[in-house]
């Protein structure tokens, strides 16, 4: 080994070196939280970049760059260090126009903490292992969601466009002419029935057990879907999103009520099956796999 390499190894294995890097990262994180940093922080930035460069140089000199089994770039954690340094120099010395987008990558410096704190490294390792193990469960989940999304598509396509429409049209007004002239929400409220405090027109359906319109209104299928058009079963992708919402129970009761009002109460069976299978079974299966992965990592 050359003297330079010997010195590099000594520095690398020294506890003070790890301490210095950890303190640098934490200080850097504190500086990154500043809203309007003063001008002198620019010099501090250069110092941080210098320390990170020094750290990487020490690692490269001690372990080698990329040829060989235990070299710098063979360790995935060092990829992060490398990217941090590259972006530091890019944003500082290269004029790339929209630099603010590149500055975002400075946040990656905070992730360096993981590689420095041993306990954290183990946990993240376990997390990565669990993601690998999750692949089968994920395939099963996507498959189940897809099947139910297709069922939802067949059952409820277009149903959430049903609205309660005012009966008393003017002599020459048609649905089309009205829809073409409606611009503001106030215009919509003139022709469609809205419950107090509601952003969307009252949903209704054509089956006997679906929601009925109040007196003076009739059910028509026109306009956009509820929630600014984001809630629907009109295409496979929207249906899939709706099913994902049910699985994660993200304000699912609203979707449930909207669909039952538009399609009919019988379809509650669909929601019961999806909630039991998707929300109770699949979610817990995912948690079980993650728990197993952590257990394996600990052993």
């Amino acid at each position: 080994f050359s003297p330079l390499r010997r010195i590099s190894i000594k520095i690398l294995v020294h506890s003070l070196f790890s301490m210095l890097i950890m303190c640098t990262i934490l200080t850097n994180c504190i500086f990154m939280t500043m809203n309007n940093p003063p001008d002198w922080t620019k010099n501090v930035e250069y110092t941080f970049t210098g320390i990170y460069t020094f750290e990487s140089l020490v690692k490269i000199l001690a372990r080698g760059f990329c040829v060989g089994e235990f070299t710098f770039l063979r360790d995935p954690w060092n990829w992060l260090d490398f990217v941090v340094i590259v972006f530091a120099y890019l944003t500082e010395f290269v004029n790339l126009g929209n630099v603010s987008a590149l500055r975002t990558f400075r946040v990656l410096r905070a992730l360096k903490t993981i590689s420095v704190i041993p306990g954290l490294k183990t946990i993240v390792g376990a997390l990565i292992q669990s993601v690998k193990k999750l692949s089968d469960v994920m395939i099963l989940t996507v498959f189940c969601l897809s099947v139910f999304a297709l069922i939802g598509l067949q059952l409820f396509m277009g149903n959430l466009k049903h609205k309660c429409f005012r009966n008393s049209l003017e002599n020459n007004e048609t649905l089309e002419s009205i829809m073409n002239t409606l611009e503001s929400e106030e215009d919509f409220r003139k022709y469609f029935y809205y419950l107090e405090g509601s952003k969307d027109a009252l949903l209704c359906g054509f089956s006997t057990d679906s929601g009925q319109c109040p007196e003076g209104y009739t059910c028509v299928k026109i306009g956009r879907n509820p929630d600014y058009g984001y809630t629907s079963f009109d295409t496979f992708s929207w249906a899939f999103l709706a099913l994902f919402r049910l699985m994660t129970q993200d304000y699912w009761e609203n979707l449930y009520q909207q669909t039952l009002r538009a399609a009919g109460k019988t379809y509650m069976i669909f929601f019961v099956v999806v909630i039991f299978l998707g929300s109770f079974y699949l979610i817990n299966l995912i948690l079980a796999v993650v728990a197993m992965a952590y257990e394996e990592q600990n052993q």
Partner: nanobody, 120 residues
Framework: EVQLVESGGGVVQPGGSLRLSCAAS????????MAWYRQAPGKQRELVAY??????ISYADSVKGRFTISRDGSKRVYLQMNSLRPEDTALYYC???????????????WGQGTLVTVSS
């Protein structure tokens, strides 16, 4: 393609009666509101009466008590016209808000019109 076909028009004496009928032909998933309109020569088209699936019925003031709108099933609507007057002379149109199939939006459909002439 959905079509509305009117029938029952003709010439009648003042005080007489006529029964207009309108039927929707072609594929119809759902009919929401069916109505009768009329257009007298040189005048604007005006609403005579309408009926909704829930049974809401409304008449123009000029025909209240004389005309009766009814719906038979989901595809057919009638207009029973009694005590006809010369001012009732017009081309009577049938109009429906309907959905041709479950994937289509509700649209407005018009019939071609049937002529009612009231004269002595």
């Amino acid at each position: 393609e959905v079509q509305l076909v009117e029938s029952g028009g003709g010439v009648v004496q003042p005080g007489g009666s006529l029964r207009l009928s309108c039927a929707a032909s072609g594929p119809v998933f759902n009919i929401n509101r069916m109505a009768w309109y009329r257009q007298a020569p040189g005048k604007q088209r005006e609403l005579v009466a309408y009926v909704t699936p829930t049974g809401d019925i409304s008449y123009a003031d000029s025909v209240k008590g004389r005309f009766t709108i009814s719906r038979d099933g989901s595809k057919r609507v009638y207009l029973q016209m009694n005590s006809l007057r010369p001012e009732d002379t017009a081309l009577y149109y049938c109009r429906a808000l309907l959905q041709p199939d479950r994937y289509s939006n509700t649209r407005t459909y018009w019939g071609q019109g049937t002529l009612v002439t009231v004269s002595s």
